[in-house]
Every structure is written in C-alpha cells, then in structure tokens.
C-alpha cells in the first residue's frame, strides 16, 4: 500500500464507519400475515430505522458483506392455547441467499409456554429472545418466522422486534 | 474535506474509537427500592464499569449521540407468587429525554413465570432478557423497570444486569 | 504524536479493525460430555467461525484485550424432568484467568422449565439466553456451563450456541 492508497482507504473507512450498518424494526398490526410467510415489520415510524441495510417483504437485506449480530424478540401470549398445553412455539431467524433455493436456519428457539396456563381460560405471557453473530453477503436476506404465529402478541413495537448491526 | 481537516477527523476518530461508549451495570442489594422508581445499579465494583457513558439514579446517561445496543437481564424467582398464576411480570427499558415529560418505552417483555411453581414445591426461577438498538441523543437517559419488582432476585451481580454499547 | 507515528497507528488500527475479534460457536453432538466440564462447541462447520479469537476445550480464548459482548443460548427440553417439576437449570458464562485458580461467574441464569410440563403432556421446551459486556485480558478464557446438562437439546447448531465480539 502506498501512502496515497492507504489514505484513500482510511478516508473511505472513516466515511463507511459513520454508517456502520444497523437496523431495528418493530412489530406492527400488519406483522402477522397468517399466510405462512415471515413476520412483517415497521421500518420508519417510532423506534424503527434502517441504516446501511434495506428492507423487503419482512426481510433485512444486506448491502455490505460482513459479520452481523442479528437479533429478534417476540412477545407471546394468549388465553389458553390453540393446541392446549402441548403447544410448542418455534421462533427463528432464517437466511435467504440467491445461492440456495431454501431458507437456512440461523438462530432458533423452541418454547412450550402454555404449560404456564393451567386451564382453557388461563391468561399467560412469555417472551422469546434470539441473538447471535452470522456472516452475511451483500444481497442476502434475514427474516423472522414464528410458528404458531397466532400466539404472537403485538402492541406498540416495543415487545416484538427484529434488528441487526455489523460487528 | 481538505487533507488537513480529514487528518484531524481521523485522529479524533481514532481517539474516540478507543473509547467507544460501553457500560455494564450489575444488580446489588440496593437495586430494589420498592419506591416505584427504576432499578438501581452497581457501577464500579466487580464486573460493573462505565466507559463513555455516565450514571445517575438508576439511569445510564448518554454523553455521545448515536445508535446503541442496550440490554438488560433480570433474574426472577420466588416461593409462590403474590397473585398466583395470574401474576405477570413486566420488564422494560425506558428512555427519559429532556424533550418529553414522560418516560418512553423502548424494549419491553411480559412473562407469567408463576406457572413454573407446582403443586407442592412452590419454588420457581425464570429469567427475562431484553436487547435492541435504539438511537439516543446526548443527555438522554435509559432506565430499567420491573413490575412486580418483588419477584426480582439479586445475588452477586451476575444474574440481573443492565448495559449498553454504541454500534 | 508526530504525524508519522499517528499514521502508523491509523494504518495499524485500520488493519486491526478489519479483524475486530468475533466468534460464533455452535452446538454439536459432542457438546455434552457428561464429565462435569463446560460445554464443547463446533468452531468451523456450518455457521461456526472464529475471527481474532481462538478456541480450546470448550473455551473462547482472548487474543486481544478489551471489552467484549459475550452471549450464549441453550435450547432446553425433555420428557418430564430428572428431578421432577422442581428441577432447576443454571446456564452461565464463566471466565478462566491465569491470575486466579477458580472460574469466575460472569453472566448467569436460573430457570425452572419443568413447570411447563403438565400431567397429560410431559414434553416441554424452553430456551435460555445470556448476553452482556465484560472486560477480558489476552489469554483469558470464557466457557459455558449448564447444570443439569441432561436437559440441553442439541440438533443442528442453531438452537444452542456461544459467541462474542469486541465492542
């Protein structure tokens, strides 16, 4: 590296550092589609933002390749459970890549929150948090899925959310 | 940007990068006030530290504006529950800003942990973790609240904590 | 600092910034030893990687001193529980340092997941997530322990994992 080249790289790095990719997307009334697709998210209002990442149909889309800490929390709750006490919830972060036809599991949790309800009429609340570092290439996408999404409770964007930042 | 200006900015960035704001505060005997206020935290002893952030009456105070990953974990537990299976715990991170009179919800979880206590053995444990990226201006504060705080178990600073770092 | 010295530091920082230490280790069939030792992890296959950190017998080993956000998730589950409904699980991140003979607790969670199993359906799932910022010196190690590890469920590296990155 000559000093000029190094200088250019440093200038570029400083500028890119100013926009270290980060995003925080929040739950909204439209998040739960019931279509079997991923959860959808608010990207602009309230606490939601995108910086150096983009969004498409529920997915955070990577612009700059690198290692990202990705995270999601979902607020679960209900009055009783659709499958009774045996109901299991799977909450996961999945990657979509142009190089592979199917979604790839990245981070996944399974919970049985309904054991907290003791009868059909019992109100219960639970929460699932996931976070971890994964490598993402430009153009790859990350989505959140919850099965059974009927048990996800949305309110004001503070209880269910999805985000990422480059590390 | 002239090269001299860029140089100064780079030097400044290098120096500020050395103190990328971060903090980790730990639970202590004095954390639970019972006054309806936020939880209080240890800032110096053991694993606790402040770097580029300050602390005031339970709050992490932002010195440098930017996007921060903020997090908190609380250890919950008890022998039975004050409201039985109906007992709900709300654990949240809230923002205080000079521009608005009321605290703003940032990240919140609700749990019904008391279903974990069973017929004879009334002892139960649960944990709540929150983390997410939010934008904070200089002078803004973040606090942790737990309702019902009677269900928070403190011991040695490893089970209940509160932290942040700039992303 | 003369400009040459500053220049060298900036060049060095740029290069080291390219390898900001980070790692994500995943659960594997060999993770649970039953020996009373820490959990073991996959470091290369699938989603697992090491960048600027090394690995030894279950431990992430720090090469470069600094503040690290460390995290772990474990997937818990079972059919009934070995100690009945009163079973408690402790999931923790612990530090090993050459300066002290015993492991130091960093971040710990206790849960009573078996209250989620009920009389008729004894199958249950639960998850425990830990994350927080700690200071680590070069040569220090971080490990994950779960007591009772019989309740940890491994599958494909997405449900139980361990990672860190410098902040």
């Amino acid at each position: 590296d000559g000093p000029a080249g190094s200088w250019e790289q440093l200038i570029q790095e400083r500028r890119s550092h100013e926009v270290n990719p980060a995003a925080h997307l929040t739950g909204a009334n439209s998040s739960l589609t019931g279509s079997g697709g991923p959860l959808l998210w608010e990207t602009q209002l309230g606490l939601a933002f995108l910086r150096g990442l983009s969004y498409h149909d529920g997915a955070l889309v990577v612009t700059k390749a690198g290692y990202y800490y990705i995270y999601s929390k979902v607020q679960l709750g209900g009055v009783g459970c659709p499958l009774g006490l045996a109901s299991t919830i799977t909450h996961g972060l999945y990657k979509r890549t142009p190089r592979y036809p199917e979604e790839l599991e990245l981070l996944v949790s399974q919970q049985s929150p309904c054991g907290r309800a003791t009868s059909s009429s019992r109100v219960w609340w639970d929460s699932s948090f996931l976070g971890g570092v994964v490598h993402l290439e430009a153009g790859e996408e990350v989505v959140v899925r919850v099965l059974d999404e009927r048990l996800v409770r949305l309110r004001d964007g503070t209880r269910s959310y999805f985000g990422a930042f480059m590390v | 940007d002239g090269p001299a200006g860029s140089w100064e900015q780079l030097i400044q960035e290098r120096r500020s990068h050395e103190v990328n704001p971060a903090a980790h505060l730990t639970g202590a005997n004095s954390s639970l006030t019972g006054s309806g206020g936020p939880l209080l935290w240890e800032t110096q002893l053991g694993l606790a530290f402040l770097r580029g952030l300050s602390y005031h009456d339970g709050a992490l105070v932002v010195t440098k504006a930017g996007y921060y990953y903020i997090y908190s974990k609380v250890q919950l537990g008890g022998v039975g529950c004050p409201l039985g299976l109906a007992s709900t715990i709300t654990h949240g991170l809230y923002k205080r800003t000079p521009r608005y009179p009321e605290e703003l919800e940032l990240l919140v979880s609700q749990q019904s942990p008391c279903g974990r206590a069973t017929s004879s053995s009334r002892v139960w444990w649960d944990s709540s973790f929150l983390g997410g990226v939010v934008h904070l201006e200089a002078g803004e504060e973040v606090v942790v609240r737990v309702l019902d705080e009677r269900l928070v178990r403190l011991r040695d600073g490893t089970r209940s904590y509160f932290g942040a770092f700039m992303v | 600092d003369g400009p040459a010295g500053s220049w060298e530091q900036l060049i060095q920082e740029r290069r080291s910034h390219e390898v900001n230490p980070a790692a994500h280790l995943t659960g594997a069939n060999s993770s649970l030893t039953g020996s009373g030792g820490p959990l073991l992890w996959e470091t290369q296959l699938g989603l697992a990687f090491l960048r600027g950190l090394s690995y030894h017998d279950g431990a992430l080993v720090v090469t470069k001193a600094g503040y690290y956000y460390i995290y772990s998730k474990v997937q818990l589950g079972g059919v009934g529980c070995p100690l009945g409904l009163a079973s408690t699980i402790t999931h923790g991140l612990y530090k090993r340092t050459p300066r002290y003979p015993e492991e130091l607790e960093l971040l710990v969670s206790q849960q009573s997941p078996c209250g989620r199993a009920t009389s008729s359906s004894r199958v249950w799932w639960d998850s425990s997530f830990l994350g927080g910022v700690v200071h680590l010196e070069a040569g220090e190690e971080v490990v994950v322990r779960v007591l009772d590890e019989r309740l940890v469920r491994l599958r494909d590296g997405t449900r139980s994992y361990f990672g860190a990155f410098m902040v």
Epitope: - | G77, V79, G80, P82, G84, L85, R153, R155 | -
Partner: antibody, heavy 119, light 111 residues
C-alpha cells in the same frame, strides 16, 4: 385500617356442610392472598389452603382436598370457606389470614369463627 | 410435608428475663439465601399475631425485644426482656412448600 371480619359461630351435625365468610376492608382486596387456618381444641394451628382473590385460583392442603372449597366475591371483598362432610374432629376455630406484602406470611387475621360439629 | 418441631413444649421464665424458643424443620426451608420461616404469637380467645417473617424480619408494630434467627432447618425466637403481655403460645411456620405447616407450639408461662 386493615380489617378481616368473619361470620358468627356455627353448630352443625356430622355429614353437614358449613360456610364461613371473611369480609376484608382497609386495603386493595385483590392484591393479597387469603389463607384459611384452623385451630382445634388442644391442637396446634393447621393450614387449610389459600385463595387468590384476583383470579379465584385456589391451593388446598391435600388433607382437605375434596371437602374444602374456597370462593371469592370481589364485589363485596369477601372470601368464603365451605367445608363439607363434617365430622366431630372438624370442631375448631376457623381463621382467615391475609397474605403479607411478601405473601408468604399472614399479617392480618380475622377474629375467628367457632364451628362445632355435634350430633 | 415438612414437619416442624418446637422445643420446649412449655417454657417458664420470669418477667424481665430472656426467653429462647427453638424450632426445627424436617428439611431446609431456605431459598436463594432467604429462610421461609415465620413466628406467631397467640393468646387465648385471640387470633394469631405475626411477629417475625422470613426468619429474622420484625413485623411492623412488633416491639424490638422480639428477634428471630437461624437458617436451613434450625431457627430461634428470642424475647430479650419478657413483659407480662408476652406470656402466650408461640408458633413457628414454614412457607417454602405446600402444605404450609406449623410447629405444635411453645407455651411461654410466668415462672
């Protein structure tokens, strides 16, 4: 001030049922557990179980399961204890005891209701 | 169930003297560094009165001459200087596990 006022003494025949009331005042009724404890002549105190007024959820001492029933009327801040299939050894003073703020002790008690079971 | 055993069954002490009452549980009543043990006083014709909760915490309105100590399975109630109104029956009670159980009582009488 906190007060728990119980119904008056009862005399019952073996096999009958008795229903004792406990009316609470001076605090937020649904925020505290209510326990039932009895004391038989020459015996010690015996915990019968608890009710959570907020939900009506109950926990019974196995010894009284199937015979004791606790209910709540939130509109009048009253809890009830009904004991069926009475026998002579059920002769006792029955107390309601409020769960304390930290809920695992009983900080206020009713004055007691004497139930006599005799043929 | 957890069996609570109090001793002595009867304790005769003079006013102004110290009284020490013991209670043993058949298994530990501790959880997370806290003991789920309470002490009550009962006088004839009256309901029980909470004196000490969580082994050593003095209930509001109870005179400071009453104190509690112990952990695990062994507990003590101490009355530092007996007053005439302290002569009564004292019960220990565990609340770690259902059913809650009481000791058989210690009768404190005037010597």
């Amino acid at each position: 001030q906190v007060q728990l006022v119980q119904s008056g003494a009862e005399v019952k025949k073996p096999g009958a049922s008795v229903k004792v009331s406990c009316k609470a005042s001076g605090y937020t009724f649904i925020d505290h557990i209510m326990n039932w404890v009895r004391k038989a002549p020459g015996q010690g105190l015996e915990w019968m179980g608890r009710i959570y007024p907020v939900s009506g959820e109950t926990n019974y001492n196995q010894k009284f399961m199937g015979r004791a029933t606790f209910t709540v009327d939130r509109s009048t801040s009253t809890v009830y204890m009904e004991l069926s299939s009475l026998r002579s050894e059920d002769t006792a003073v029955y107390y309601c005891g409020r769960g304390s703020y930290y809920w695992n002790a009983m900080d206020y008690w009713g004055q007691g209701t004497l139930v006599t079971v005799s043929s | 169930e957890i069996v609570m055993t109090q001793s002595p069954a009867t304790l005769s002490v003079s006013p102004g003297e110290r009284a020490t009452l013991s209670c043993k549980a058949s298994q530990s009543v501790d959880f997370d560094g806290e003991s789920y043990m309470n002490w009550y006083q009962q006088k004839p014709g009256q309901p029980p009165r909470l004196l000490i909760y969580s082994a050593s915490n003095l209930e509001s309105g109870i005179p400071a001459r009453f104190s509690g100590s112990g952990s695990g399975t062994e507990f003590t109630l101490t009355i530092s200087s007996l007053q005439s109104e302290d002569f009564a029956v004292y019960y220990c009670q565990q609340s770690i596990e259902d059913p809650w159980t009481f000791g058989q009582g210690t009768k404190l009488e005037i010597k």
